[in-house]
Each structure stands twice: as C-alpha cells, then as structure tokens.
C-alpha cells in the first residue's frame, strides 16, 4: 500500500431498492476489486423539503474524484441527487453537503465553516 493512503475494505451499505421490497438490506459491504484499482465508499441522498432521504450507500470503485478524501462531502451546488465518496473503512457512515462557493473578491482571510453532517 502507498504510504498515507487509507485502504477501503468495507463500507456502510444501504440500498433503498431493497428496502422498498421489504428485505431490509442494510449492513456492511466488503469491497472487492482488482489489485491495481482503488476502492472507495460512497453515499447518495436526496433533500426533500429539508428531510434527508438516503438512496444508496456502499462500495465505489476506482474514481479519481474520490482519491485521498477522508470525509464524504458533496461539493456541487444544489444537485438533484447528492453524491459523495471517500477512502477509508466505513468513511461513508457520515456524509455532508458543503457547496463550494465561487468567491470573486475575498476581502479577508476566508473562514471555512464546518459542514453539516448527516448519518
């Protein structure tokens, strides 16, 4: 393993597809993949009138957008479906939305507010 890289071997699993079929498929998913590919965890959810509705959580495979991210944070501004990914066992247990604002002229040192976490 590369020094400093957080290997992902398992992720929190949830799949609304299975839930609606009353099979209660939630748990811990082991992540499998080719030796030369990186493995990640992800979460995807909707915000319906301020209520968080998880769609899926589980393993995600070799995506450069997930490399070296220890926290699961969605940075897109107001997506229809929120998505985040991260590296490290069960790193998708908590996920957050923290849109990157386009600041044209900062007048002072920017302060990064702590993003809201959901779990």
């Amino acid at each position: 393993a590369i020094l400093g890289r957080s290997e992902t071997q398992e992720c929190l699993f949830f799949n609304a597809n299975w839930e609606k079929d009353r099979t209660n498929q939630t748990g811990v998913e082991p992540c499998y993949g080719d030796k030369d590919k990186r493995r990640h965890c992800f979460a995807t959810w909707k915000n319906i009138s301020g209520s968080i509705e998880i769609v899926k959580q589980g393993c995600w495979l070799d995506d450069i957008n997930c490399y070296d991210r220890t926290d699961c944070v969605e940075k897109k501004d107001s997506p229809e479906v929120y998505f985040c990914c991260c590296e490290g066992n069960m790193c998708n247990e908590k996920f957050s939305y923290f849109p990157e604002m386009e600041v044209t002229q900062p007048t002072s040192n920017p302060v990064t507010p702590k993003p809201p976490y959901y779990n």
Partner: antibody
Amino acid sequence: QVQLVQSGAEVKKPGSSVKVSCKASGRHFGSLQISWVRQAPGQGLEWMGGIIPIYGTANYAQKFQGRVTITADESTSTAYMELSSLRSEDTAVYYCVKDLTWTNLGLDIWGQGTMVTVSS
Amino acid sequence: EIVMTQSPSSLSASVGDTVTITCRASQGVSRWLAWYQQKPGKAPRLLIYAASSLHSGVPSRFSGSGSGTHFTLTISSLQPEDFATYFCQQSYSTPFTFGPGTKLEIK
C-alpha cells in the same frame, strides 16, 4: 477471479417449472451480489432479480414476482433461479451474473448462459 | 419502471471511425448507468460502469459520459472487433432495465 458455470440446456412443457443452477468458483461467494438476466431469441436483455447469499433474501422484478425464486447455497457456492408456470414466451437464454458491488454498479462477470426452451 | 431508449438502433461505420451511441432514461438514474457489448452467441461484456468508469481490461478507446437522464458511449478509432451490439442499463431503481440495443455494423 470469480467464474460462473451454469447448468445445461433445458426443454420444458408449458405450465411446468425449470431450475437453473450457477456455480461460482473463487472466493467470497456469500458476499457477492448475484443477479439473473434473460434474453429471448433475437431480443434484448431483461433483469429478473438478484440475491446477496449472506442475506438470503432476494429482490425480484415485479414482472416475475410470484413466479420466480432465486436462492443461494453458500456451502456449495451455487445460486439457483427457479421459474414456474412456464409459457412459450419464457423461451430464452438465462444468465447468472456477478455485480461489481451490492449497489449494482455493473454486471461484470457472466455465466455462459442456459438455454431454456418451452414447447408443447 | 424506468424506460431506457437508445439511438440510433443501428449504424454503419468503418474501421478507424469514431462513433457515439446515446442512451436516455425516462427518469433520472444519477450515475447508475452501465454499457455492455454483445456479440452473436456470446454473453454480454461490461464496458463502462457508473456512467464513465472504464471496466478492467476494456480498451481506452471506449468512453462513457453523462448523468441523470442522458448518457453517451463513444468508441474512437473503431477496430474490427468492435462491431457488435451495445446495450445500456440503469441500476438506480428496480426493476433494473436495459436499452433495446444499438447494432454497430461494418460499412
């Protein structure tokens, strides 16, 4: 590397049942997501349902609900798909397939297919 | 049920060409879109998963893009072995559904 080997071709009468097996070689059978997909001659692909063996419960397409049963035997690393009340339109190649992840990112390993012919 | 449509249903191209196949979903499927290649008498083969991730062992001339309801598969510098039928599939919501296929023929 997982490999999936399916049982041989079947010829069945309308109204009867067929049970197709799918034996997996390689590790971690219990924690794989196994799906079944069928393809009628010259037609497209149709997802029937899937199972994660360690959970034991299957998820079915509404179209087949009540007529299909998907099971798995962890001791033999074998998944099964049983389809009952067969009709001529069930004539198809039936594939068992491994998914990349439990949340169904993509069907990456396919069995060789089992041809099921329903004819009187 | 999410209905998947593909266009064109068939196309002719020559070795070395670049071709693009489009897949549309009747509802948003986020990134849960895969592309498969199938040759006569053979099982389908996974090419692209999660809309744009290239599956292991698939040549880099295959690429996928899109999210939500509109997706594309592009094959650049067509090779003789690429002439086949291509299917898209959504796995965002059960029942998982496939497009009707696009048959890529040699010109």
